[in-house]
């Protein structure tokens, strides 16, 4: 019989390497049953997780499971960090592992690519 | 040549609400951020949101979440900034320009709309 | 947020100077930092990019320098037509935020 807990799918240690100024999707997958939970992202600070309230996210459904999406619209290097969703289902708090963004720029990408390319949107040069 | 270029200025009553336009043209429209600046006082920047024409993703400045919108129509290369319930505060020149270069520079810029609110 | 503080607030040139503008972060912003001119009654220009990149079509006297939290722009020989406001800003950090100003005047 299939658990109708939430379960919130981010494999431990997962990590993205992302560009900054490029537009950016964080998913987080979460399986739930009847009622879709409450679902925020935060921002891990040392000990503590700092909920991003500022952010747009939204939520993506598929036939078996579900993603609560985080957006960066773009990326900007600050956004480099460790993020975890976490769920409130029954008065329980669930959360995911984190998942590490590392954001690199193109001054510092192993090729630094032409004038005309910097000053052309990323999201059609570094796909 | 690559050109923005806002719609006229706005006298409004407070509680009124104006969408201002900013037209693009002389590049792709769906390849670079658009972002919105409110100048008050002829003095300091403020930085209202971006939005990305592709997706209509947006990122907005928290203080001015749920009071500006911003939206873009692909098919006349035009965003879009709506502003509801209108106060003397929000009495400024708005500004639409491009973020060209990564991360986030703006290297062009609208003409500037001048919104008054005044009864 | 980061607050991005200039300085002078504004100051009076004779043309043929060497002109000096400040721009100080609250926090490290590594070299995410531009610079804009903005004339009267005009919309902003960007001048430098990545805290000392040059953008197209801008003149060889204006130059940017410094990262971290200490930031300069400097105009070489400042020239009749250079009186505008000079904004600095930060695309390090949601949000971005921008300077007062410096309103450079010529004598």
């Known amino acids: 019989k299939e658990s109708c807990d939430v379960q919130l799918y981010i494999k431990r240690q997962s990590e993205h390497s992302i560009l900054a100024g490029d537009p950016f999707e964080l998913e987080c997958p979460v399986k739930y049953c009847a009622n879709r939970p409450h679902v925020t992202w935060c921002k891990l600070n040392g000990t503590t997780c700092v909920k991003l309230e500022d952010r747009q996210t939204s939520w993506k459904e598929e036939k078996n499971i579900s993603f609560f999406i985080l957006h960066f619209e773009p990326v900007l290097p600050n956004d480099n960090g460790s993020y975890r969703c976490s769920a409130n289902f029954q008065s329980n708090l669930i959360e995911s592992h984190s998942t590490t963004l590392y954001v690199t720029d193109v001054k510092s990408a192993s090729e630094r690519p032409s004038k005309d390319e910097m000053a052309s949107r990323p999201w059609l040069l570094y796909r | 040549e690559v050109q923005l270029q806002q719609s006229g200025p706005e006298l409004v009553q407070p509680g009124a609400s104006v969408k201002i336009s900013c037209k693009a043209s002389?590049?792709?429209?769906?390849?670079?951020?658009m972002i919105w600046v409110k100048q008050s006082h002829g003095k300091s920047l403020e930085w209202i949101g971006n939005i990305n024409p592709n997706n209509g993703g947006t990122t907005y400045n928290q203080k001015f979440k749920g009071k500006a919108t911003l939206t873009v129509d692909k098919s006349s290369s035009t965003a879009y900034m709506g502003l509801p319930s209108l106060t003397s505060e929000d009495s400024a020149v708005y500004y639409c320009?491009?973020?060209?270069?990564?991360?986030?520079?703006?290297?062009?810029w609208g003409q500037g709309t001048t919104l008054t609110v005044s009864s | 947020n980061i607050v991005m503080t200039q300085s002078p607030k504004s100051m009076s040139m004779s043309v043929g100077e060497r002109v000096t503008l400040s721009c100080k972060a609250s926090e490290n912003v590594d070299t995410y930092v531009s610079w804009y001119q903005q004339k009267p009654e005009q919309s902003p220009k960007l001048l430098i990019y990545g805290a000392s990149n040059r953008y197209t079509g801008v003149p060889d006297r204006f130059t940017g320098s410094g990262s971290a939290t200490d930031f300069t722009l400097t105009i070489s020989s400042v020239q009749a037509e250079d009186l505008a406001d000079y904004h600095c800003?930060?695309?390090?950090?949601?949000?971005?935020?921008f300077g007062a100003g410096t309103k450079l005047e010529l004598i």
């Open positions: 002389g590049y792709t429209f769906t390849d670079y951020y």
């Open positions: 320009a491009r973020g060209g270069l990564r991360p986030l520079y703006f290297d062009y």
């Open positions: 800003g930060q695309s390090y950090s949601y949000p971005l935020t």
